[in-house]
């Protein structure tokens, strides 16, 4: 059932990175507007993005309340200028989204190498602990705060003069690696949640190389 001249939304898609979560859909509206509702499996529906002509709705504020819950959204279509109008079944046309569990599905954002420090033949590489929009006690939690033991980082490093890459892993945000004295190295890191089946890895961080500003070199 539906209202004359309204079409149901389709291709409802969750776009989420580090819990910043937006629902997108099609089509671009022609003489119609949309309202989005979101709910947990056991909860009540909450309306967002009322009578919008956009084809996206930021649902971050709702999902960060409990990132381990499974959420469902639906997009209602209304005729522009007549939002009280309903279909023959007595309700506006709507389409359901796929289920979305932020903790298991949000994409891991591109990490950043915060610093590296060389002491003799050891280099300590620190990954920035990126802030998320998940809150606890009025403070924003970092990615490590939220994912805890489920989050690891992989470090790729290589001599500036060659292409052979080595890897290291850490379940903290720091690596301590052995390097050859007198050689410059380049570094890139990747966030990984090994226990996931989807969106397991982030994109690689920008490459940082020794001899540039971020690092510090101490000959011991």
């Amino acid at each position: 059932s539906g209202t004359t001249n309204t079409v149901a939304a389709y291709n409802l898609t969750w776009k989420s990175t580090n819990f910043k979560t937006i629902l997108e859909w099609e089509p671009k509206p022609v003489n119609q507007v949309y309202t989005v509702q979101i709910s947990t499996k056991s909860g009540d529906w909450k309306s967002k993005c009322f009578y919008t002509t956009d084809t996206e709705c930021d649902l971050t504020d709702e999902i960060v309340k409990d990132v381990k819950q499974t959420y469902l959204a639906r997009v209602f279509s209304y005729p522009a200028g007549n939002v009280e109008s309903t279909g023959s079944a007595g309700e506006p046309l709507y389409e359901n989204s796929p289920e979305f569990t932020p903790y298991l599905e949000t994409n891991l954002g591109q990490p950043t190498i915060q610093s590296f420090e060389q002491v003799g033949t050891k280099v300590n590489v620190t990954v920035e602990d990126e802030r998320t929009l998940v809150r606890r006690n009025n403070t924003f939690l970092s990615l490590r705060d939220v994912f805890g033991k489920d989050l690891i980082y992989t470090l790729y490093y290589w001599k500036s003069s060659s292409s052979g890459k080595k890897t290291a892993k850490t379940n903290t945000n720091e690596f301590l690696i052995d390097v050859d004295k007198g050689e410059n190295y380049c570094f890139s890191v990747q966030a990984v949640i090994p226990s996931r089946t989807v969106n397991r890895k982030s994109t690689d961080s920008p490459v940082e190389c020794m001899g540039q500003e971020k690092g510090e070199f101490r000959e011991i």
């Epitope: 499996k41 819950q69 569990t101 298991l104 606890r136 939220v146 805890g148 033991k149 379940n171 089946t197």
Partner: antibody
């Protein structure tokens, strides 16, 4: 409210296998690690392994590798722990547990009532 | 595998304060070990008190507090009651597995 309901007591012969179940309710089953911990009579707690139901990812205590298998059935929100090649020293109460998630609190907040497994010839 | 060490037994007077410690054979305990504290009273099921180093469960009285002190995880109990008499287990995470300590039998006397 979070509940973990375990299966009933079992008596097994040495060399046999046992499969203990843990039915979860009151939360999103897929998102939380379920831990398995055992306690032999008069002894302390011993971690056996864990499973994340959403992906079936598992981690096992080296001591039990090859003998323990953890699985899940998402349709019934149930996790299973199977221990094979039983010996008398496997006589213990077997618990499932789940963390209390508040940011990243991991571990052993909620506990099942325990399943007594007795291995005796 | 790492070994987690706790005091075998401790005694505290009613109303007193006691500190239980949890050491790791691999070195300093850090927040990456996600220290857990589990209480087990005689004949009862284990009960989670603290997880993730310092997060109390909703049922955990504010008289219990978890922290890291120096190189070890610590459970502090203020204003001990007789009902706090129990065995307290510490568990630490090591990259891909948990290890429990042997437990501390706390007597309130």
């Amino acid at each position: 409210q979070v509940q973990l309901q375990e299966s009933g007591a079992e008596v097994k012969k040495p060399g046999a296998s046992v499969k203990v179940s843990c039915k979860a309710s009151g939360y999103t089953f897929s998102s939380y690690w379920i831990e398995w911990v055992r306690q032999a009579p008069g002894q302390g707690l011993e971690w056996m392994g864990e499973i994340l139901p959403g992906s079936a990812s598992t981690k096992y205590n080296e001591k039990f590798k090859g003998r323990v298998t953890m699985t899940r059935d998402t349709s019934t929100s149930t996790v299973y722990m199977e221990l094979s090649s039983l010996r008398s020293e496997d006589t213990a109460v077997y618990y499932c547990a789940r963390d209390y998630y508040y940011g990243s609190s991991y571990g052993f907040a909620y506990w099942g009532q325990g399943t007594l497994v007795t291995v005796s010839s | 595998q790492a070994v987690v060490t706790q005091e075998p037994s401790l005694t505290v007077s009613p109303g007193g304060t006691v500190t239980l410690t949890c050491r790791s054979s691999t070195g300093a305990v850090t927040t990456s070990n996600y220290a857990n504290w589990v209480q087990q009273k005689p004949g009862q099921l284990p009960k989670g008190l603290i997880s993730g180093t310092n997060n109390r469960g909703p049922w955990t009285t504010a008289r219990f507090s978890g922290s890291i002190l120096g190189d070890k995880a610590v459970l502090t109990l203020w204003g001990a009651h007789t009902e706090d008499e129990a065995v307290y287990y510490c568990a630490l995470w090591y990259s891909n597995h948990w290890v429990f300590g042997g437990g501390t039998k706390l007597t309130v006397l």
